[in-house]
């Protein structure tokens, strides 16, 4: 599986999830989120090479496509497969809120 | 929506369904499949702009960042959302079988 | 690589001020929390306030509230933490700590502020 | 505020032996969670962050566990050079308070 487990740990240059820190304030301008100050989004990227984590027949036909025709442009691109929420605390007035927000954090990746 | 009705009437460079014609001897190789000849798979491709038809929340914050930090090689990649199936003739010694592959034509896409 | 210098030890008269200066290289001075902590000969870590030099944007423990003022000089890449009305109970190692992902992950290496008639 | 509880007080292992210590939130902060090592004379070295990762430079032997109110710091393979107080303390919300050390 293209996930942290693998890719972080290897030198991968073929699609894989990459390890991404996003600070709240100073990468996204949200001053409202008191906690965490940021985290690790993570994304997706590297090329798809034929059946490399396809995620439909589509993308498997597509990576074939490509191989066969190199000067194409169409190809599977990678993108997040598997994602994670992200529990974040903030302020109404002085009234503390605690949130979760889905799909946040990106644990692995697939051709597409 | 990012679907075929939209984009093919539209010279949009943003992230779109594009049309791809694969000839199935052709382009893939694959002299089993008796009818179609070919058919149209299509592909997604283009930018993916700050909340242009954006994933999840992951897609919606990466598009910000990327927006915020232009020299970052993190950003949302366009990708297929509805997929059709294709059904296929093909033959088993002299026997026509004929078979339905599922997602095997875009009809719309996400930044994801 | 990241460093964090502060300035000397300090010893002040109960009901005095004391200002500690903390300077930073090594990364984004305006872009990360500055937290500020102390510790009291022999006893634990006590968290005090932190500031985001980008805004100067500010958040204080409540048991510090109207002594403690932290500062920074973005030209500098210097931070600062002024504790006013010293008690000897302030008789502590004053750190400054960068924030970063959960944690504080640079220390400087303290300054020794002394309170005593 | 959030009160922090680290048990055991002390600690004690031989060399190679595996150590546990423990740190309780009075309430929940999820993973936002940092453990550090204080050696007498120095100031505290950041070994564990977001409750489970390992900080830049720290062996291997250290792992942080839980999520929640309940965390652990493992020790495993102990070396004396592993003699220090160790700290826990809480990124949810400020003031972000400490235990009162192992």
């Known amino acids: 599986a293209l996930d942290t487990n693998y890719c972080f740990r290897n030198l991968e240059e073929n699609c894989c999830v990459r390890p991404l820190y996003i600070d709240f304030r100073q990468d996204l301008g949200w001053k409202w989120v008191h906690e965490p100050k940021g985290y690790y989004a993570n994304f997706c990227s590297g090329p798809c090479p034929y059946l490399r984590s396809a995620d439909t027949t589509h993308s498997t036909v597509l990576g074939l496509y490509n191989t066969l025709n190199p000067e194409a442009s169409a190809s599977p691109c990678c993108v997040p497969q598997d994602l994670e929420p992200l529990t974040i605390l903030y302020y109404v007035g002085r009234t503390p809120k605690v949130e979760q927000l889905s799909n946040m954090v990106v644990k692995s990746c697939k051709c597409s | 929506a990012l679907d075929t009705n939209y984009c093919f009437r539209n010279l949009e460079e943003n992230c779109c369904v594009r049309p791809l014609y694969i000839d199935f001897r052709q382009d893939l190789g694959w002299k089993w499949v008796h009818e179609p000849k070919g058919y149209y798979a299509n592909f997604c491709s283009g930018p993916c702009p700050y909340l242009r038809s954006a994933d999840t929340t992951h897609s919606t914050v990466l598009g910000l960042y990327n927006t915020l930090n232009p020299e970052a090689s993190a950003s949302p990649c366009c990708v297929p959302q509805d997929l059709e199936p294709l059904t296929i003739l093909y033959y088993v010694g002299r026997t026509p079988k004929v078979e339905q592959l599922s997602n095997m034509v875009v009809k719309s896409c996400k930044c994801s | 690589q990241v460093l964090l210098v502060q300035s000397g030890a300090e010893v002040r008269k109960p009901g005095a001020s004391v200002k500690i200066f903390c300077k930073a290289s090594g990364y984004s001075f305006t872009s990360s929390w500055m937290n500020w902590l102390r510790q009291a000969p022999e006893q634990g870590l006590e968290w005090m306030g932190q500031?985001?030099?980008?805004?100067?944007?500010?958040n204080y423990n409540g048991k510090f509230k109207g002594r403690l003022t932290l500062t920074a000089d973005t030209s500098t890449n210097t931070a600062y933490m002024e504790l006013s009305s010293l008690r000897s109970a302030d008789t502590a190692m004053y750190y400054c700590a960068r924030h970063y992902d959960g944690s504080t992950d640079y220390w400087g290496q303290g300054a020794l502020v002394t309170v005593s008639s | 505020a959030i009160t922090m509880t680290q048990s055991p007080g002390s600690l004690a292992g031989s060399p190679g032996q595996q150590v546990t210590m423990n740190c309780r939130a009075s309430?929940?902060?999820?993973?936002?969670l940092a453990w550090y090592q204080q050696k007498p004379g120095q100031h505290p070295k950041l070994l564990i962050y977001a409750a489970t990762n390992l900080a830049d430079g720290v062996p291997d032997r250290f792992s942080g566990s839980g999520s929640g109110t309940d965390f652990t710091l493992t020790i495993s393979n102990l070396q004396a050079e592993d003699v220090a107080s160790y700290y826990c303390?809480?990124?949810?919300?400020?003031?972000?308070?400490f235990g009162g050390g192992t």
């Open positions: 303390q809480h990124f949810w919300g400020t003031p972000y308070t």
């Open positions: 500031i985001y030099p980008g805004d100067g944007d500010t």
């Open positions: 309430e929940n902060i999820y993973s936002n």
